[in-house]
């Protein structure tokens, strides 16, 4: 069967530019190695935000310079994206790939619309 991936429709980043959401997948197979990728869709262009491969039961490891962090629990991944600004508002898509053992499966969520509002600068005080 095709793999289903679920994620929230909308998330609001906090005042520090941090947004978190859960990406949940229904695994058709017994995967031991999973790859999670966050994609950003703006207009019709899709770009990769970050990606991590993890062993089931272990933590996700993103690259040191990644703006993403995450934790996994069963078929659920808790993703956090930081350093967001108003211009980063957009649709963030969770892609899950069951890499090992074969067969390979891929699932793509419908996307989470992340809204980012830049904080107002503090007024000067005399």
């Amino acid at each position: 069967k095709a793999m289903h991936v679920a994620q929230p429709a909308v998330v609001l980043a906090n005042s520090r530019g941090i947004a978190s959401f859960v990406c949940e997948y229904a695994s058709p197979g017994k995967a031991t190695e999973v790859r999670v990728t966050v994609l950003r869709q703006a207009d019709s262009q899709v770009t990769e935000v970050c990606a991590a491969t993890y062993m089931m039961g272990n933590e996700l490891t993103f690259l040191d310079d990644s703006i993403c962090t995450g934790t996994s629990s069963g078929n659920q991944v808790n993703l956090t994206i930081q350093g967001l600004r108003a211009m980063d508002t957009g649709l963030y898509i969770c892609k899950v790939e069951l890499m090992y053992p074969p067969p390979y499966y891929m699932g793509i969520g419908n996307g989470t619309q992340i809204y980012v509002i830049d904080p107002e600068p503090c007024p000067d005080s005399d």
């Epitope: 069967k1 095709a2 190695e33 770009t47 890499m99 074969p102 067969p103 499966y105």
Partner: antibody, heavy 118, light 107 residues
Framework: EVQLVESGGGLVKPGGSLRLSCAAS????????MNWVRQAPGKGLEWVSS????????YYADSVKGRFTISRDNAKNSLYLQMNSLRAEDTAVYYC???????????WGQGTMVTVSS | EIVLTQSPGTLSLSPGERATLSCRAS??????LGWYQQKPGQAPRLLIY???TRATGIPDRFSGSGSGTDFTLTITRLEPEDFAVYYC?????????FGQGTKVEIK
Amino acid sequence: EVQLVESGGGLVKPGGSLRLSCAASGFTFSSYSMNWVRQAPGKGLEWVSSISSSSSYIYYADSVKGRFTISRDNAKNSLYLQMNSLRAEDTAVYYCARVGLMGPFDIWGQGTMVTVSS
Amino acid sequence: EIVLTQSPGTLSLSPGERATLSCRASQSVSRYLGWYQQKPGQAPRLLIYGASTRATGIPDRFSGSGSGTDFTLTITRLEPEDFAVYYCQQYGSSPWTFGQGTKVEIK
């Protein structure tokens, strides 16, 4: 310009070997999974093999398993297919194809012809 | 292995007419289905992915629909350059599989 260019095809006898290459340009090759797809004369498309961006995960069609080996060299922006124990039914145009971020094969090379005949 | 069956095998139409191509999967592929166009002597070109999203640079006369096991590619007004072979492909699981193709020829 995003481009894939295959080479290495030719005429080989049954049981022989051949190594195909695919040179990538115009995109960050090391970020994408890659595939080989073949097309026998007058026939449809058949997926042959896939390799992940870092070569950690490799998949083969049952028809080539144990005979073909896919590999890549990210430093050289190149994809390879080592074909051993070739059979007449391996005669086809071989295409390399990039896996797009959303899953389909979004960029294809022009193909290289492999003929297995005595 | 997921088997994709395309119909009809050949479609004979005139420029300006509407083409409707079908692709049926042996089991659900959700929306992980793409459509490709191939002209003689050329490589396939991605037209549609995600069952209904046009790839970059594809004119809006091409549209895709469907989910699960039944999919359709529609070309609203055939242009001379649209006469070609069209393949569907599922990319949700390995082995990646293609349909046998539908040839759209000039009537």
